[in-house]
Interface confidence: medium
Amino acid sequence: DASGDLLNTEAHSAPAQRWSMQVPAEVNAEAGDAAVLPCTFTHPHRHYDGPLTAIWRSGEPYAGPQVFRCTAAPGSELCQTALSLHGRFRLLGNPRRNDLSLRVERLALADSGRYFCRVEFTGDAHDRYESRHGVRLRVTAAAPRIVNISVLPGPAHAFRALCTAEGEPPPALAWSGPAPGNSSAALQGQGHGYQVTAELPALTRDGRYTCTAANSLGRAEASVYLFRFHGAPGTST
């Protein structure tokens, strides 16, 4: 009978997807590194190809400050970034393929917290959805790491030494060198975020110059050797 046919048709038609978002409960990363915040979704609008906006916010769902936003034009797979807080956030996923995964660069301890992904369909579908529980990003402190140590030509045929280290909390840098006193004045400048640089402006003696980086989690050392009679500086770490 007719009702049987209707039931049969219903039984064989593909069920509409519900809105849902899949995010991990937690992502762990070390300060200074990058982290990926995964977010995928399903939605009930089959083959939606209209304009869409992908948003990530921090703190609390629906009301927290946005840290990233991009918009894709109808039919386009390119999501044009409209907001990336401090330029450290970029979309890894393709929203057209139900993926809003986000990469966060140069992590600092202050980036710890909850992040919420959101997608908005602003064409015919008029719909949107946001992860309510979000993903918790845990940024762990990092022991110091010396990322660059070098000797460079300075004024009046002198040499200067540069030491760049990273860590969270930002490490304190100190230079030590050949006697007398076995230590030399260093100009220390704050780098960006988790990086610091210290300069030894004038290397007055040949010998070994050591940069020490220390924070509450540990210390790291690296050395350069200055032998002017060799005609060029050598380095050792």
Epitope: W19, S20, H126, R132
Partner: antibody, heavy 123, light 107 residues
């Protein structure tokens, strides 16, 4: 049937804090969220905050620094606290149920309301 | 924040007549709009959500329409019990915001 009932102090002195309770029946706070909305005398409606079924919260950012919301599912009660009250906070304070709070999405409407509790800020 | 503007703060109406109340959002809210009715001394009552969907128990003489930024609540053959203040509310984004209200007054 679904019911919400607000209770509060009525009169609050300027710079003091306000505590209001919303007691619900006919549904469980484990399954539904609750909004707070206020209405100054003769004026329109202002949304304050929503507490979701799982206890997470969404505040009106303009008032967030002065608001605190919590709940006790077992007692079917939602609590609103507001600090540093001024005369401009004189209003009827309503709690209202957030209608859908499940896998299917979220709908920021308010399908059942309490009768409200009148709060006057005056010395 | 999205501002909601109801053009008329009050409308003079006749029983049995048709009333149209308008609401304009400062940004696109993509049909995420609700209408509430409030009578003096009472709490608001939800009439319509999703711009057009009538809530259970709301008489069919009420209807909602609109898209984008512009929305309308219509009441056909107005009854005495419809004399009230009507508020629109957007729920596209937080914070949720209401219009200032339109009060219906009998001629």
């Amino acid at each position: 049937q679904v019911q919400l009932k607000e209770s509060g102090p009525g009169l609050v002195a300027p710079s003091q804090s306000l505590s209001i309770t919303c007691t619900v029946s006919g549904f469980s706070l484990s399954n539904y969220g609750v909004h707070w909305v206020r209405q100054p005398p003769g004026k329109g409606l202002e949304w304050l905050v929503l507490i979701w079924s799982d206890g997470s919260t969404t505040y009106n950012s303009a008032l967030k620094s002065r608001l605190s919301i919590s709940k006790d599912n077992s007692k079917s009660q939602v609590f609103l606290k507001m600090n540093s009250l001024q005369t401009g906070d004189t209003a009827m304070y309503y709690c209202a149920r957030h209608p859908y709070d499940d896998y299917s999405g979220y709908y920021y409407t308010m399908d059942y309301w309490g009768q409200g509790t009148s709060v006057t800020v005056s010395s | 924040d999205i501002q909601m503007t109801q053009a008329s703060s009050s409308l003079s109406v006749s029983l049995g007549g048709r009333v149209t109340i308008t609401c304009k959002a400062s940004d696109h809210i993509n049909n995420w709009l609700a209408w509430y009715q409030q009578k003096p001394g009472n709490a608001p009552r939800l009439l319509i959500s999703g711009a057009t969907s009538l809530e259970t128990g709301v008489p069919s003489r009420f209807s909602g329409s609109g898209s984008g930024k512009d929305y309308t609540l219509s009441i056909t053959s107005l009854q005495t019990e419809d004399v009230a203040t009507y508020y629109c509310q957007q729920y596209w984004s937080s914070p949720l915001t209401f219009g200032a209200g339109t009060k219906l007054e009998l001629k």
